[in-house]
């Protein structure tokens, strides 16, 4: 019989008494096959951490400090369930981190050296640790102590707690720093003031402070926040403008082996029996021997943490960061304006291989870090690991939602102006073999069929899409008998037609031979009946252009399109049966990472790009043999996007609603998990 | 101007070795890495193997566990060791430096 027992781990006699009290109301709630509750007494958050990855505990609750402490080696544990607040039709699990000016000061993020600041308290997350971490390698060196340095980077500041006698400067715009609200400048309310005040030129709050104090629109307008790009917005867009985002309160459990499933099904029920306005016996996020004992009093419930993320994607890079530049104190040489070498992402061993040659030829201006699949480096993209990719528009827009932007869009057609005008985008195709003369969109019903991968645009989110509108479910498994769409589940009769051996079957890469366009297209030619690829696909693989064994004899001719008013077409017509229109795959970075990304590319395909012509004797940075590595090979320049950039703008409102719809349908773990941090 | 000249090639029998070397006239050579590439008759040349400057070593797929690419910097050489090769590693082998022109490469023929 598996233990349904989780080990939750206590940090105060208040703590353990709370605890027992929940076992013992669990108990008589949950049948004695479902979960149960023991409790561990510890001396410290510290101590519970290690416990749990020792083995000797299995759950704690933590602030997002105490939340990277215990995601550092050797702990490794992961966030499972976090708390949220507000209401359960709008959860709030998060809070943003802010910087709030008054509007007509004409300052930016970088120009707070010699600004006076106004924080909630010294070593206080959203007040003193995110702004100064952030700020940390631009404050004047020595760096410690830490107070003196952030004394003489402003001219005067306001941190309750800090020590007035030491750093007097610290407490200049409020005498004492006294750190309770005897201080009038003390805490969230109290940083605000010192700001409205006059007293301060910018006040490290939390996005509800302003909302909390000013009730008035018309008063709140009259104050900006500063972005980390440089820029300013109103402060009602705090989610696209603050300094972090920040969870509140998390559970957390191993990484391995960590009990999360049952740790989810004991909150959840937890939750049910004793949650807000559950039960005057006993109240789950009630403390009346203390405040905030095991779960914060504030507490409305749980939310289950998606398996995909892990600590670093939850607590998000800005703030890990931050958290990293306070603990270990470690900065850059000298800051200087030079771009550092752009860390591309490479999947699987040959793009990896071909990343290492343009490392190689870019004389130290790129770097290569490997990953598995598309979502996985976007994932290191997201955390620093990694800063830029070229994504078909199916991942820009999961990389979007994950808080990544487009920075350049790959062009496939020559013209003279090519690196100023991105393009409207390519044509998603259905091919069929000629031969199969009676197959048209309306009878693809129990077909085999080959898609690029899943989530991609052509291969996937556009025929997909289209026959989901057709046939209003999801069990796309079951609509055809058999096809390869690499990314399925490894059991799924959408996997029974790939090529890849062993693990490497179905893998979304380059290891399994039917991945990408050309991959889809031999599918089609070697076993499947319809195969879902751009317009261009079928001319790059025909008539000898691509000397392949499999692909060296084939004829354009012996291929059609099929179009969606139920006729057929021959290839070159694609302009008047096509599925959709798909947006151009582009390149996608960090926000902070965005300027340098463009500049060090455009550089790039200056040396390596369309105007070198014997790419025999010269790296090609456009060209790899057919298999589109990096970048589609038919790529003739990446071009500047202009005003779109946003994965909204980039993609269009017609590409983003159909992909919005798919979402249903969704399998991918990385578009829930960073959901969960933006709905 | 630096040149690079390539040696080590010859006739081998299927299963046997050889080791080329890539020695760079001038200094600098290979800090930034320095990479072998084959062109066998009637095919694009293609990348085997690279080595940077900071050792890090990578190769393609069909010569990995049997190639090894190493470099002695104070000798302005790099080597390719290969080993059970096979007819398919036939081609003339060439080393490449960013900036350096191509060298006129080292013949390699595999055959029984």
């Known amino acids: 019989v598996p233990d349904k027992t989780v080990r939750w781990c206590a940090v105060s006699e208040h703590e353990a008494t709370k605890c027992q009290s929940f076992r013992d109301h669990m108990k008589s709630v949950i049948p004695s096959d479902g979960p149960s509750v023991a409790c561990v007494k510890k001396a410290s958050y510290l101590d519970c951490i290690r416990a749990i990855a020792a083995n000797e505990a299995d759950a704690v609750t933590l602030d997002a400090g105490l939340v990277y402490d215990a995601y550092l080696a050797p702990n490794n544990l992961k966030p499972v369930v976090a708390e949220f607040y507000g209401s359960k039709e709008d959860p709030q699990t998060f809070y943003y981190a802010v910087a709030v000016v008054k509007k007509d000061s004409g300052f930016q993020m970088n120009q707070l050296r010699g600004k006076k600041s106004c924080h909630t308290g010294l070593g206080r997350s959203a007040g003193w640790n995110i702004p100064i971490g952030l700020l940390y390698c631009d404050l004047p060196e020595p760096r410690k102590p830490l107070e003196k340095a952030v004394a003489n980077f402003f001219s005067g500041s306001c941190a309750p707690c800090a020590d007035g006698t030491d750093f007097p400067q610290l407490c200049q715009l409020c005498p004492g720093c006294g750190c309770s609200t005897l201080n009038q400048y003390f805490g969230y309310s109290g940083a605000f003031k010192c700001l409205k005040d006059g007293a301060g030129d910018v006040a490290f709050v939390k996005h509800s402070t302003i909302f909390e104090n000013l009730a008035n629109k018309a008063d709140r307008d009259q104050y900006e926040l500063l972005c980390l790009d440089n820029t300013r917005k109103p402060v009602d867009e705090y989610k696209d403008c603050h300094l972090a985002q920040v969870p509140s309160h998390t559970v957390v459990a191993r990484s391995m082996g960590g009990k999360e499933d049952l740790i989810w099904e004991l909150l959840n029920q937890a939750q049910e029996h004793f949650g807000k306005d559950k039960s005057k016996e006993f109240q789950l996020f009630s403390s009346p021997h203390g405040k905030d004992l095991l779960f914060k009093d504030s507490a409305h419930g749980f939310l289950k943490v998606p398996p995909r993320m892990d600590a670093k994607m939850y607590l998000g890079y800005e703030y890990v960061t931050a958290i990293r530049n306070l603990r270990e104190g470690t900065c850059p040489e000298a800051p200087t304006d030079e771009c550092k070498p752009v860390k591309w992402c490479a999947l699987s061993h040959h793009e990896r291989l071909k990343c290492d040659e343009w490392s190689v030829n870019s004389v130290g201006k790129i770097e290569c870090v490997s990953a598995e699949t598309t979502e996985d480096c976007i994932a290191k993209i997201m955390n620093g690991e990694a800063d830029a990719m070229s994504l078909d528009g199916g991942f820009v827009y999961i990389a979007g939602k994950c808080g990544l932007v487009p920075v350049l869009a790959e062009n496939y057609n020559k013209s003279d102006n090519c690196e100023d005008t991105p393009e409207a985008g390519y044509f998603a195709i259905a091919v069929v073999k000629k031969s199969a003369s009676d197959l048209t969109w309306d009878n693809l019903k129990g077909k085999k069929s080959c898609h690029t991968a899943v989530g991609r645009t052509a291969g996937w989110n556009i025929p997909m899409g289209l026959l989901y509108n057709k046939i209003n479910h999801c069990r796309f498994d079951e609509f055809f008998s058999e096809g390869c769409a690499p990314g399925s589940k490894k059991d799924s009769s959408l996997c029974k037609l790939c090529m890849g051996s062993g693990l490497n079957l179905c893998e979304p890469n380059n290891k399994e031979g039917y991945y990408g366009y050309t991959g889809a297209f031999r599918c089609l030619v070697e076993k499947g009946d319809v195969a879902f690829v751009k317009h261009q696909t079928v001319p790059q693989n025909t008539g000898g252009k691509n000397p392949d064994p499999w692909a060296k004899n084939l004829n354009e001719k012996d291929y059609e399109l099929l179009c969606l008013d139920g006729t057929r077409k021959p290839v070159e017509e694609y302009a008047n049966c096509h599925l959709a229109r798909a947006p151009n795959h582009a390149v996608v970075t960090r926000k902070d990472k965005e300027a340098c990304v463009h500049k060090i590319l455009r550089q790039q395909q200056h040396l390596f790009g369309s105007n070198v012509t014997d790419c025999s004797g010269n790296f090609c940075l456009f060209r790899s043999e057919t298999k589109d590595l990096l970048f589609r090979d038919d790529t003739v320049c990446l071009a500047k996007l202009h005003d779109r950039n946003t994965y909204e703008k980039y993609l269009g409102e017609e590409y983003v609603k159909a992909v919005g719809n798919l979402r249903k349908c969704s399998t991918s773990s990385l578009l829930e998990a960073c959901t969960f941090r933006r709905p | 101007q630096v040149q690079l000249v390539e040696s080590g090639g010859g006739l081998v029998q299927p299963g046997g070795s050889l080791r080329l070397s890539c020695v760079a006239s001038g200094s600098g050579f290979g800090i930034n890495g320095v990479i072998w590439y084959r062109q066998a008759p009637g095919k694009q040349r293609e990348l085997v193997a690279l080595i940077k400057s900071d050792g890090y070593t990578n190769y393609r797929e069909s010569v990995k566990g049997r190639f090894t690419i190493s470099r002695d910097d104070a000798k302005n050489t790099v080597w390719l060791q290969m080993s059970a090769l096979e007819p398919e590693d036939t081609g003339v082998y060439y080393c490449?430096?960013?900036?350096?022109?191509f060298g006129q490469g080292t013949q390699v023929t595999v055959s029984s």
């Open positions: 490449k430096t960013p900036g350096v022109p």
